[in-house]
């Protein structure tokens, strides 16, 4: 028969014959021959291969370096890489999460729109009219101004995006 020019899925062409690829979690140690199938061996501890492959070396699991603020979110297997995330209060600098930076705080006049996660930074928004934030925080939202009326008080000092209103007693009408 004619030697093949293309092979089935999960096979590869070598020396004019189709050989089976190694399954995820295993590496290639010998191509198939007339007398034997492709020979594969499992990846070692702390190694992985995540596809059907003909790799002769497994990939090393990612190291979540605590010096860079990283910790293990999901331990790697022979078929999957380790997934890193950041320590509490930090977030990844990239999708690959190779290092971490401290969550940003929202300055006075700004509130937290979305609290940071291990992979995304704090999202701040300016406090709209009727709301204020007087602290630098990674958690605090803009607070509504105090409603003086509900306390039977009147506004003595108007609020800003950084300060609350100041309420005071109503002026009593003299007889």
């Amino acid at each position: 028969p004619e030697p093949p020019t293309a092979c089935r899925e999960k096979q590869y062409l070598i020396n004019s014959q189709c050989c089976s690829l190694c399954q995820p979690g295993q590496k290639l140690v010998s191509d198939c021959t007339e007398f034997t199938e492709t020979e594969c061996l499992p990846c070692g501890e702390s190694e992985f291969l995540d596809t059907w492959n003909r790799e002769t070396h497994c990939h090393q699991h990612k190291y979540c370096d605590p010096n860079l603020g990283l910790r293990v979110q999901q331990k790697g297997t022979s078929e999957t890489d380790t997934i890193c995330t950041c320590e509490e209060g930090w977030h990844c600098t990239s999708e690959a999460c190779e290092s971490c930076v401290l969550h940003r705080s929202c300055s006075p006049g700004f509130g937290v729109k979305q609290i940071a996660t291990g992979v995304s930074d704090t999202i701040c928004e300016p406090c709209p009219v009727g709301f204020f934030s007087n602290v630098s925080s990674a958690f605090e939202k803009c607070h509504p101004w105090t409603s003086c009326e509900t306390k039977d008080l009147v506004v003595q000092q108007a609020g800003t995006n950084k300060t609350d209103v100041v309420c005071g007693p109503q002026d009593r009408l003299r007889a």
Partner: antibody, heavy 114, light 112 residues
């Protein structure tokens, strides 16, 4: 053409380590595996193990605790070590190249006796 | 490990006889690729085994056409259609589908 030649001491004392060398020609150790197989006198064949091109090894589970296969690519040599031998390890030892099953070494008889 | 059981363990036959040797494996030798790695070897006294048949039914180059192999799954057969004087030897089946590779215990073909 492909050739393999086994060599080593023909007599080993019980409890000692059997050491054999397989010298190959006609193919490349960095790209091909080498197997060891043995045959006790008047008995059948037993696969001992293999060293693959990259240096990884597979051993027969029945011998794994006692066997080590290694190689020196620069000398075209593969080595078999079998520790704590007994009379049951007396056999003709063969090496053969992976994918060259038509070509075996001529074999070397190792007798375990005091 | 996969056990390979040959039968008979020995047989007596005459030149010109048709000889059949069977080999049974303890589990299927069909690889996920669809290939079955079952070999037959011939061994004469004081010599290394010589390859006759590979992948169940493929005759190795230079092997006479009187040797043929057949079978599938777990049951395999080596047939010598017309026994010749040089065929008196011991025959082994061998599987290389699964590590550790294993051999049958051998079938000795003797002159009747």
């Amino acid at each position: 053409q492909v050739q393999l030649q086994e060599s080593g001491p023909g007599l080993v004392k019980p409890s000692e380590t059997l050491s054999l060398t397989c010298t190959v020609s006609g193919f490349s150790l960095p790209t091909s595996g080498v197997h060891w197989i043995r045959q006790p006198p008047g008995k059948g064949l037993e696969w001992i193990g293999v060293i693959w091109a990259g240096g990884d090894t597979n051993y027969n589970p029945s011998l794994k605790s006692r066997v080590t296969i290694s190689k020196d690519n620069s000398k075209n040599q593969v080595f078999l070590k079998l520790s704590s031998v007994t009379a049951a390890d007396t056999a003709v030892y063969y090496c053969l190249g992976h994918g060259h099953f038509d070509v075996w070494g001529q074999g070397t008889l190792v007798t375990v006796s005091s | 490990d996969i056990q390979m059981t040959q039968s008979p363990s020995s047989l007596s036959a005459s030149v010109g006889d048709r000889v059949t040797i069977t080999c049974r494996s303890s589990q299927s030798l069909v690889h996920s690729s669809g290939n079955t790695y079952l070999q037959w070897y011939q061994q004469k006294p004081g010599k290394a085994p010589g390859l006759l048949i590979y992948k169940v039914s493929n005759r190795f180059s230079g092997v006479p056409s009187r040797f043929s192999g057949s079978g599938s799954g777990t049951d395999f057969t080596l047939t010598i259609s017309s026994l010749q004087p040089e065929d008196f030897a011991t025959y082994y089946c061998s599987q290389t589908t699964h590590v550790p590779w294993t051999f049958g215990q051998g079938t000795k073909v003797e002159i009747k």
